[in-house]
Structure formats: structure tokens, C-alpha cells
Interface confidence: low
């Protein structure tokens, strides 16, 4: 079957997100991928969206992330905009209302996004072949 247009949009957004670091991509988020053996794909997407929503809700106005220079400010605002887009698309792909995120493990946002990108690319390669 053909790949969902949402999946293509997610990969495109993840590519943009992982291209440049900001002051806050080194901050930690819940690592939902650490122990996801008994988790369905939809649950994984839902939980990833939840983690991203928690991150941007908490750090959108964080002055440590906004930085002191105009360039740092632009980059953080762009990061938040991309995270919101990613959150919205992941919810669409998951089709679930809510999902628990209880893991204790942490990972940097940067690593979290790289891992998510790998998963999405794998999914894309399967659905496009």
C-alpha cells in the first residue's frame, strides 16, 4: 500500500529538526524507546507525541532556550514550531486519544528525534516497497 502523506510530512519535519542544534536540544526527555518491546506502533507514536508535547509546553518560553542573541531566538522558535507540527502529525498517525508515559529512562531531545527519525524511515521503506 502507499505511504501515508502524514508519514512523509513527519520525516520531512524530523529532517529539519535534526539538521541544527539549539540551546535546548541537549535537554532530556522521557526515553519511550528504551523499553518498547510490548508496545504497538500506534502506542509508540502516541507516546512520542506526548513526550514532545510535554517538552514544548515546558520549554516554549524558557529563556535558557530562547537565548540572548537574535539567532538563538530564531532557532528556538523554529524548533518549537517544528515540534508542534510533529506532535500534530504523530497524533494523526496514532489515532489514539491518550497514552501513558511512565518510563524513568531519559534521553536528550536530539537523540530522541534521531531515534524517531530512524523508526519513521524504516516504516517508510516498508510501505513504499
Amino acid at each position: 500500500h502507499k505511504c501515508d502523506i502524514t508519514l512523509q510530512e513527519i520525516i520531512k519535519t524530523l529532517n529539519s529538526l535534526t539538521e541544527q542544534k539549539t540551546l535546548c536540544t541537549e535537554l532530556t526527555v522521557t526515553d519511550i524507546f528504551a523499553a518498547s518491546k510490548n508496545t504497538t506502533e500506534k502506542e509508540t507514536f502516541c507516546r512520542a507525541a506526548t513526550v514532545l508535547r510535554q517538552f514544548y509546553s515546558h520549554h516554549e518560553k524558557d529563556t535558557r532556550c530562547l537565548g540572548a542573541t537574535a539567532q538563538q531566538f530564531h532557532r528556538h522558535k523554529q524548533l518549537i514550531r517544528f515540534l508542534k507540527r510533529l506532535d500534530r502529525n504523530l497524533w494523526g498517525l496514532a489515532g489514539l486519544n491518550s497514552c501513558p508515559v511512565k518510563e524513568a529512562n531519559q534521553s536528550t531531545l536530539e537523540n530522541f528525534l534521531e531515534r524517531l527519525k530512524t523508526i519513521m524511515r524504516e516504516k517508510y521503506s516498508k510501505c513504499s516497497s
Epitope: 530564531h74 523554529q78 514550531r81
Partner: nanobody, 116 residues
């Protein structure tokens, strides 16, 4: 053609106040986030404050938080920056800017000098 015209700068004593205005034209003002950026003599650009399209949220750099207030009047296509409790380190050229990724249009700037 997009135009941003700042006004309201000048010389003020420490602890004093100023209100900067930015008259915008050439684009649909209410559809864009707007901000203030400043450049102190011999230094790089520093973002000061930001207000999104709807104006419900406002953002401030730590250095001005609690002293500066950004606002906008979409009916007048005008952006404002109320600056209170001014300090010598606030001395800079203040620029009004449109959009944030990156700021794609700038005004000519207005000079604010804080000195006794």
C-alpha cells in the same frame, strides 16, 4: 513593499521610561508575529521581545523581563514597546522586526540612550 518605521527613541535618565512605536505597512500586519531586537554600540544583535499574531502570549529576554512590555494594535498596524526602569545597559539602537524564522524585515531603528 514592506515598511517598518520606528519612533520614540531618545535620551533618558536611568530609571526613566520610553515608549517605542513601530508603524507597519505593505503587509497584513495581523497575520504576522512581530518583535523588537536591539544592538548596543560595538555589540551583536540581541532579541528583546516578541509577540505572536494573536498577541495572547508575549516573550521577553531575561535582561528586560519585568521592565519592558510589548503590545500591538492590529487596527492601527502598530507595534509598541513600553520601556520602564531603564538602565545604562539598555542603550542601543532598537529595531522593529517582522516574523521570526528568521526576522525577514527590519526597520531602520531608533536610538535609545540611557545616561545621566
Amino acid at each position: 513593499e514592506v515598511q517598518l518605521l520606528e519612533s520614540g527613541g531618545g535620551l533618558v535618565q536611568p530609571g526613566g521610561s520610553l515608549r517605542l512605536s513601530c508603524a507597519a505597512s505593505g503587509f497584513t500586519f495581523e497575520e504576522y508575529g512581530m518583535g523588537w531586537v536591539r544592538q548596543a554600540p560595538g555589540k551583536g544583535l540581541e532579541w528583546v521581545s516578541w509577540i505572536p499574531e494573536g498577541g495572547r502570549r508575549t516573550y521577553y529576554a531575561d535582561s528586560v523581563k519585568g521592565r519592558f512590555t510589548i503590545s500591538r494594535d492590529n487596527s492601527k498596524n502598530t507595534l509598541y514597546l513600553q520601556m520602564n526602569s531603564l538602565r545604562a545597559e539598555d542603550t542601543a539602537v532598537y529595531y522593529c522586526a517582522k516574523n521570526y524564522s528568521p526576522f525577514d524585515y527590519w526597520g531602520q531603528g531608533t536610538l535609545v540612550t540611557v545616561s545621566s
